[in-house]
């Protein structure tokens, strides 16, 4: 037996002016049939029948997955981060082979002192999370390490992280210039070789809500756009109300098609509505026909 899906019919007038009956199943889209056991359903656009109903893929919904949603959930990360690969040369500690072993007492003590020193250096940077030593080598001690930065996601996160990386560069340059050995002795927590300070690489979290929105919208990518509300991105079509890009269909219903958003104008007992935004009303004539 076939699973039947009720199809409701609405009397609407397209923006071109002609009255049309629109079934909720869009006959212009090829139908794929999904069969589970002896049930089958006309689940379209990649949707599948779960035994009870069509399970639709984004951006579709409806009994047959024939309609396009007005908004798509996009979830930016709570926080975004940057990782700076730096090298500094510590002159107040002499290199020994034990420093290469990350489980040695020597490495653990060096790591503790170095971390304390860097926490002091970067204490004024709100995005600063910590440092991670990746390698120690001879000369006195060349310290290859990562500086980790993190901030809450906002539309301007890249600027915030870029600014933080610049401050890191300024601060490490300053400390490695000021904290130097005098008479083969260090009066600071750590002393450095000024010329040994290098920024090797900077990696910033890449998150683009526009890209995520376009990917999820699939063939409707050109018609979905990102708008922000309270610093949060929303992936919307013009049919979603309450946004700057929202389409006002006045006396009609906004519907997405593969050509974009269009208004399907209503016909009431007294008026026909037409126009691109269904804002042109024509009063029906009240002639009575006598038989």
């Amino acid at each position: 037996p076939l699973a039947t899906i009720p199809v409701s019919t609405t009397s609407l007038t397209s923006s071109e002016g002609s009255t049309i009956s629109t079934p909720s199943v869009d006959i212009s889209t090829p139908v794929t049939t999904s069969i589970v056991g002896d049930q089958c359903s006309r689940c379209k656009n990649g949707g599948f029948w779960d035994g009870l109903k069509c399970q639709c893929l984004t951006p579709y919904y409806g009994e047959s997955c024939e309609e396009v949603v007005n908004s798509i959930d996009i979830a930016p990360p709570e926080t975004v981060s940057a990782q700076m690969e730096l090298t500094v040369t510590v002159t107040s500690v002499k290199f020994t082979d034990e420093l290469k072993n990350h489980s040695s007492q020597e490495f653990r003590e060096f790591n503790k002192t170095f971390t304390e020193q860097m926490n002091i250096v970067y204490s004024g940077i709100p995005e600063y999370v910590g440092v991670n030593i990746t390698n120690l080598r001879l000369g006195s001690v060349v310290v290859e390490h990562d500086v980790l930065l993190r901030t809450k996601y906002t539309p301007e996160y890249k600027t915030a992280l870029d600014n933080a990386t610049e401050v890191v560069k300024q601060k490490i340059t300053k400390v490695t210039t000021e904290q130097i050995m005098t008479n083969d002795n260090c009066s600071a927590l750590m002393c450095f070789n000024t010329t040994g300070t290098q920024v090797q690489n900077i990696t910033v979290t890449q998150y683009d809500p526009v890209e995520e929105c376009r990917q999820k919208a699939e063939e409707y990518e050109d018609y979905f756009l990102v708008e922000y509300r309270d610093q949060k991105p929303y992936c919307i079509s013009p049919c979603e109300s309450g946004f700057n890009a929202s389409k006002n269909c006045n006396h009609g219903k906004c519907q997405m098609s593969q050509n974009g958003a269009r208004c399907l104008c209503v016909t009431t007992e007294t008026h026909w509505y037409s126009g691109e935004d269904c804002n042109q009303g024509t009063q029906k004539s009240h002639h009575h026909h006598h038989h």
């Epitope: 002499k94 034990e98 503790k112 304390e116």
Partner: nanobody, 123 residues
Framework: DVQLVESGGGLVQPGGSLRLSCAAS????????MSWFRQAPGKEREGVAI???????GYADSVKGRFTISQDNAKNSLYLQMNSLRAEDTAMYYC?????????????????WGQGTQVTVSS
């Protein structure tokens, strides 16, 4: 757990001498560094002398030529020979140790400490 115990402090007249000792619980620091620090009442702790496993020694300017740091690895001991003592040398003297070959007389660079021994220079 590493333990450091100082001894040898006491009351001495100006111009006199004292020898401080520091016993480490094992020879862990024979490949690192050991040092002496002091702290006078109401003042910050300051570095006095360092000795490292590579034979390097360093002294604070105020004690150069008067104090000598030495080590006996066989006995896991550190010493500070103090000559020509002055009233301004009066302080609590602390032994500190590090697994690292350090060149730093900043107390924050040192992670292992003894309880201290009092040195008073007075007539």
């Amino acid at each position: 757990d590493v333990q450091l115990v100082e001894s040898g402090g006491g009351l001495v007249q100006p111009g006199g001498s004292l020898r401080l000792s520091c016993a480490a619980s094992d020879n862990t620091f024979s490949r690192g560094s050991m040092s002496w620090f002091r702290q006078a009442p109401g003042k910050e702790r300051e570095g006095v002398a360092i000795i490292s496993s590579d034979g390097w020694t360093g002294y604070a300017d105020s004690v150069k030529g008067r104090f000598t740091i030495s080590q006996d690895n066989a006995k896991n001991s550190l010493y500070l020979q103090m000559n020509s003592l002055r009233a301004e040398d009066t302080a609590m003297y602390y032994c500190a140790a590090s697994f690292l070959v350090l060149r730093a007389l900043n107390p924050k660079a040192w992670h292992y400490w003894g309880q201290g021994t009092q040195v008073t220079v007075s007539s």
